[in-house]
């Protein structure tokens, strides 16, 4: 079966929205009113991977852009990046592992764990206007909890 993708936005548990910061980076900041239109709309694809009731493997692309969040080693550290792909081949059901995140729902929050690097999560800083990154700690200063708002195509 072909891969199905649904559009969504994300906010961290402090209600910060995600926006583009240059061509290959996301940052998190509080938005309101008309500024909400700046927030990134993701195309979330349901991809192949280990699955349970609370854990669903997904890929997070930027809507109508050939950019996907991916997890790679940089200087021996798991790092989040926006990676450009060939739009003729993506999205696909069997995404490379660096593109796959385990969407985990715990109580009323979502976490996005890297499939490539277990226990590393999409994270934001407490501070405003800082890059979205891959963090290796939960429950510390950095924020790993999100809510998702699906939006019409």
């Amino acid at each position: 079966a072909p891969v199905r993708s649904l559009n969504c936005t994300l906010r961290d548990s402090q209600q910060k929205s995600l926006v583009m910061s240059g061509p290959y980076e996301l940052k998190a900041l509080h938005l309101q009113g008309q500024d909400m239109e700046q927030q990134v709309v993701f195309s979330m694809s349901f991809v192949q991977g280990e699955e349970s009731n609370d854990k669903i493997p997904v890929a997070l692309g930027l809507k109508e852009k050939n950019l996907y969040l991916s997890c790679v080693l940089k200087d021996d550290k798991p790092t989040l990046q926006l990676e450009s792909v060939d739009p003729k081949n993506y999205p696909k059901k069997k995404m490379e592992k660096r593109f796959v995140f385990n969407k985990i729902e715990i109580n009323n929050k979502l976490e996005f764990e890297s499939a490539q690097f277990p226990n590393w999560y999409i994270s934001t800083s407490q501070a405003e206007n800082m890059p979205v990154f891959l963090g290796g700690t939960k429950g510390g200063q950095d924020i790993t909890d999100f809510t998702m708002q699906f939006v019409s195509s």
Epitope: A1, L110, T147, M148, F150
Partner: antibody
């Protein structure tokens, strides 16, 4: 046996508010995504709100966005739909429905509660 | 939004008849289609999902087929309890929309 029982419907004036409830039993409510679907007289079914099992994900179509909110209390096995700024076109039978985990089909529905918006 | 068009909007048939209802979509939804049955004054009930998979407890006289943009629900031998409204729904992209319904009446 899966049971979904809606309540809270009634007559409300345009611009008014109403809160619908759906009491669930016969299954582990906290493990299922839930939705509200409505059916206006003589019209097709319309999906109006979605919430994931833990409440971390939601969806509203443009027709109700900004006016309706969906929530759930997993400890009480109850789903809610808060409807504000109601319009005549919101008049419908409102059903709560249990949904497959990956945002797909509705496998069980309640019997519905009628909401009438009229002055 | 993907538009769903059912045909016919109503039909009259007799017990034992073979009945076919069609659902067309404005875009390719692959096999992401569901069929529901709704009896008067009752809640809809799931009949078929993924275009052709019968839901638990649904009699084998019901079957679904199709993919892409054209789908059919077939009742091989209509029974008295099958007189109802039937709706298709896609779940390929948001919003998941329903067809306008097909009313199956007694001839």
């Amino acid at each position: 046996e899966v049971q979904l029982v809606e309540s809270g419907g009634g007559l409300v004036q345009p611009g008014g508010s109403l809160r619908l409830s759906c009491a669930a039993s016969g299954f582990d409510f906290s493990r299922y995504d839930m939705s509200w679907v409505r059916q206006a007289p003589g019209k097709r079914l319309e999906w109006v709100a979605y919430i994931s099992s833990g409440g971390g994900s939601t969806y509203f179509p443009d027709t109700v966005k900004g006016r309706f909110t969906i929530s759930r209390d997993n400890a009480k096995n109850t789903l809610y739909l808060q409807m504000n700024s109601l319009r005549a076109e919101d008049t419908a039978v409102y059903y709560c429905a249990r949904q497959n985990k990956k945002l797909t089909w509705f496998d069980y529905w309640g019997q519905g509660t009628l909401v009438t918006v009229s002055s | 939004d993907i538009q769903m068009t059912q045909s016919p909007s109503s039909l009259s048939a007799s017990v034992g008849d073979r009945v076919t209802i069609t659902c067309r979509t404005s875009g390719n939804i692959h096999n992401y289609l569901t069929w529901y049955q709704q009896k008067l004054g009752k809640a809809p009930q799931l009949l078929v999902y993924n275009a052709k998979t019968l839901a638990d407890g649904v009699p084998s006289r019901f079957s679904g087929s199709g993919s892409g943009t054209q789908f059919t629900l077939t009742i091989s031998s209509l029974q008295p309890e099958d007189f109802a409204n039937y709706y298709c729904q896609h779940f390929w992209s948001l919003p998941f929309t329903f067809g306008q319904g097909t009313k199956v009446e007694i001839k």
